[in-house]
């Protein structure tokens, strides 16, 4: 039977969701040997119904809150090895908040909170703007929210402030939440590596470009800024 005498270790990781895409709220626990003895409940602060419930090897969604209907799942075949992570379809801005992962097993009970941030973030692409009158770089990223800051840097002129020779614009996308980020850097020199860094409180993304006489090399990466 299910006992509540002891506490078990439940571990969560603060994470961020990209609105309009699928997200994962991470939660792990000390595994049990019988799936039928495991209950997983996901709750959200300020929400009356459950976010998700999984018990006896199946979802139990009769108490699920309307805002999560048809949008949640667990990795059911991984529950037995201690994975209680919640999958969230079509992340909304309103999904942000404090969630509780609550676990009951034959060994006991445990819970842990996680902060889930929502916004939009995307990889930037830096290109040479051949339409411009002078040597110009154009950095574009299709989806960001909240409005990020954009900073240019260069390998050769480390520490230089490029705000005077760059121009950044934000264009609202059709769904009226996220924005397209476009930043232009003027007067660039050849044989130099330039970086376009886009950052908000959820993510930080960098697009690098190296222009030489013979070739153009690009690289980009994105990092989520998980709150601790």
């Amino acid at each position: 039977g299910i006992s509540g005498r002891h506490s078990i270790t439940v571990t969560t990781v603060a994470s961020a969701g990209n609105i309009g895409e699928d997200g994962i709220l991470s939660c792990t626990f000390e595994p049990d040997i019988k799936l039928s003895d495991i209950v997983i409940q996901w709750l959200k602060e300020g929400v009356l119904g459950l976010v998700h419930e999984f018990k006896e090897g199946k979802d139990e969604l009769s108490e699920q809150d309307e805002m999560f209907r048809g949008r949640t799942a667990v990795f059911a075949d991984q529950v037995i090895v201690g994975n209680a992570s919640l999958r969230l379809k079509n992340v909304q801005l309103t999904d942000a908040g404090t969630y509780k992962c609550y676990i009951i097993t034959s060994k006991g009970k445990g819970n842990a909170n996680l902060e889930y941030k929502t916004g939009a973030f995307s990889m930037p692409e830096v290109n040479v703007d051949y339409n411009a009158s002078s040597e110009t770089l154009r950095c574009e990223a299709p989806r960001w929210f909240p409005q990020p800051t954009v900073v240019w840097a260069s390998q050769v002129d480390q520490g230089a402030n490029f705000s005077e020779v760059s121009n950044t614009s934000f264009e609202l996308n059709s769904e009226n939440v996220t924005m397209k980020v476009v930043s232009v850097l003027y007067n660039v020199t050849i044989n130099n590596t330039y970086s376009c860094m886009i950052e908000n409180d959820i993510a930080k993304a960098t697009g690098d470009i190296k222009v030489t006489e013979s070739e153009i090399k690009r690289r980009s990466h994105l990092q989520l800024l998980n709150s601790k």
Partner: antibody
Framework: QVQLVQSGAEVKKPGASVKVSCKAS????????MHWVRQAPGQRLEWMGY????????SYNQKFKGRVTITVDTSSSTAYMELSSLRSEDTAVYYC????????WGQGTLVTVSS | DIQMTQSPSSLSASVGDRVTITCKAS??????LSWYQQKPGKAPKTLIY???SLADGVPSRFSGSGSGTDFTLTISSLQPEDFATYYC?????????FGGGTKVEIK
Amino acid sequence: QVQLVQSGAEVKKPGASVKVSCKASGYTFTSYYMHWVRQAPGQRLEWMGYVDPFNGGTSYNQKFKGRVTITVDTSSSTAYMELSSLRSEDTAVYYCAFIAGFANWGQGTLVTVSS
Amino acid sequence: DIQMTQSPSSLSASVGDRVTITCKASQDIKSYLSWYQQKPGKAPKTLIYYATSLADGVPSRFSGSGSGTDFTLTISSLQPEDFATYYCLQHGESPYTFGGGTKVEIK
């Protein structure tokens, strides 16, 4: 109770395609990956690939080199496996299956490829 | 691809016997191993997953052990309905691969 019910036997000519369905019931369809496995007469089982019904994501056995496509229709809790450019060695029983969690597999669909 | 070597390929046993079947992976697959039972003309049935976890509705006389490269399926007291072919499957790395099977026959 958990059930996987597959479509009936098929006879196909070499070069044709076959699409086998697997209707799931008794559990939340989006919570478990659906795998496809085949067994040629007298042979060992062979894994073909899986679909994640939550988002439609797939993973395939490269042995089938783009000939296999696994899809889902979440509104009817049904998974599909399509195999194209059929050859005689594709004659086998095809199963939809859980790798973990539930014991049940589909009952199997015999696909015979013959000219 | 990861090779799964199952042994023995067949065995004869009596009702009430303790039966052990082993599966060896050609590389470390952690606990990503499942065991299946298949009777002639029937669909396979999942017995054990993640090396040690009993699938829903499977009798407790079936158990699994092992991790890494060496795995064992044990039937503690063989019943008449257990005479069948047993397969292991590694699902640690794509493509997932099955063992060759072990046929358990009546002595």
